[in-house]
Amino acid sequence: QRLPRMQEDSPLGGGSSGEDDPLGEEDLPSEEDSPREEDPPGEEDLPGEEDLPGEEDLPEVKPKSEEEGSLKLEDLPTVEAPGDPQEPQNNAHRDKEGDDQSHWRYGGDPPWPRVSPACAGRFQSPVDIRPQLAAFCPALRPLELLGFQLPPLPELRLRNNGHSVQLTLPPGLEMALGPGREYRALQLHLHWGAAGRPGSEHTVEGHRFPAEIHVVHLSTAFARVDEALGRPGGLAVLAAFLEEGPEENSAYEQLLSRLEEIAEEGSETQVPGLDISALLPSDFSRYFQYEGSLTTPPCAQGVIWTVFNQTVMLSAKQLHTLSDTLWGPGDSRLQLNFRATQPLNGRVIEASFPAGVDSSPRAAEPVQLNSCLAAGD
């Protein structure tokens, strides 16, 4: 399903063969945090990959001496602000003492702000993107990804953390939002809906897509996730919408074909390394960008969100596999794992291309209500 204006060259138009496998923002592993309770220390828990809470699980940045070279991420609870009544609300619950946020769920009590006060912040994510109101910012150059092509060995950890499926990424995946804005990829996770119900986190003019992939990155200015949480630009997430297309997406199939092995909450498996960039759209030049937060507790703000204009196409069967295979807490299906959209509260979404220009013949002249605020750094 596309919005009326989503033609090949219009905002969010044209799915690519590049695939996205977004992992939720729920658990951001910290670099030095102690291992999760679900991850008892063992030979595989070598120094250098600790878990931090965040978007799904943010992996640690220090290289592990561990076999697969994968980083361990700690689950951060995601808390969500109230959204429209039809949408699932993200409320986290704690069944541990203290500030532990690694156990929370979508919907239910307590409200996320009680789990993490930041979830009630003014600049939260996700948001509804209105291309006509986006500020065209020519300083936003094409994204640069380096080292995202991984050989099959070492293998990577694919985990059902109870609120998403998350792939922990090894050291060396470098991403630049622009000059001097350099990041390292930590993990990726997905958000999805249920049968006949879309489950992307971001929306476009109110339109929700079937699913969404998030690739979570840590700024090279920080050694650990916990140091970056809440700092402007400390974390950056690349997000792409997943749509239904006629063909199977081979890149995503490498992950989706393994979901049955991790159907149970807390289970994990090892998957061969792959081209991580193939999970993303092929067009790195057209995107929307704004400053928001993690979409799961602790909902830390200062996160730079980059939402691709181009979508990624998966087959109907693949989308069904994604939404109908995993189980979450309390013997419930892991579905509708998205947070309701949050108010912009004065924020302006920037676009790397003139998204406000309607490409259809009906557009008399471009409508661009906001101007670019960024200087490009």
Partner: antibody, heavy 119, light 111 residues
Amino acid sequence: QVQLVQSGGGVVQPGGSLRLSCAASGFPFSSYAMSWVRQAPGKGLEWVSAISANGGTTYYADSVKGRFTISRDNSKNTLYLQMNSLRAEDTAVYYCANNGNYRGAFDIWGQGTMVTVSS
Amino acid sequence: QSVLTQPPSVSGAPGQRITISCTGSRSNIGADYDVHWYQQLPGTAPKLLIYANNNRPSGVPDRFSGSKSGTSASLAITGLQAEDETDYFCQSYDSSLSAWVFGGGTKVTVL
């Protein structure tokens, strides 16, 4: 001390079989992918086979596919290479190597064992 | 013939800087796969010298550095020393072959 100690080399006739072993110590063997790499006399390095940390996935060079089998016993911290239908061109020093770290680099190597296929 | 191409030999005087090239294709180095470099002393196993294009394992002198661009990579040795006279190999992964691949090796001679 991190090390890989190899054994099992020797002289074998064409068509014969040989099994190489590689005993690991000083690191969590069961957490690492492993490979076999060979070097013919006076020649360069050639990757032969690889196996994932849990042994569930194996990979082979076209030159040995169907003849060689890589396996591991994580309870014994040992890697194996079963070589069947050996040919003269398989003559080489065989190294076991850890390729579970550094994004696919081989960071720990065994001392090597010579395999000579000759009639 | 090796998938990755290296010059058979490179020489330099003590203290000089030399570079060893490693040329691949769009299915290995050009596909954004990492390049790793090994040093092999006579009669011994190879030793990892540079991993992931430009990273040195602990214990490797900073005289050794790596770089990668397009379908090629290179190893630089500055302040060449007598003990650097040995063989060097580059390595990557090739998606077309589904195999880890090596260069043919380069013999470094210190004049």
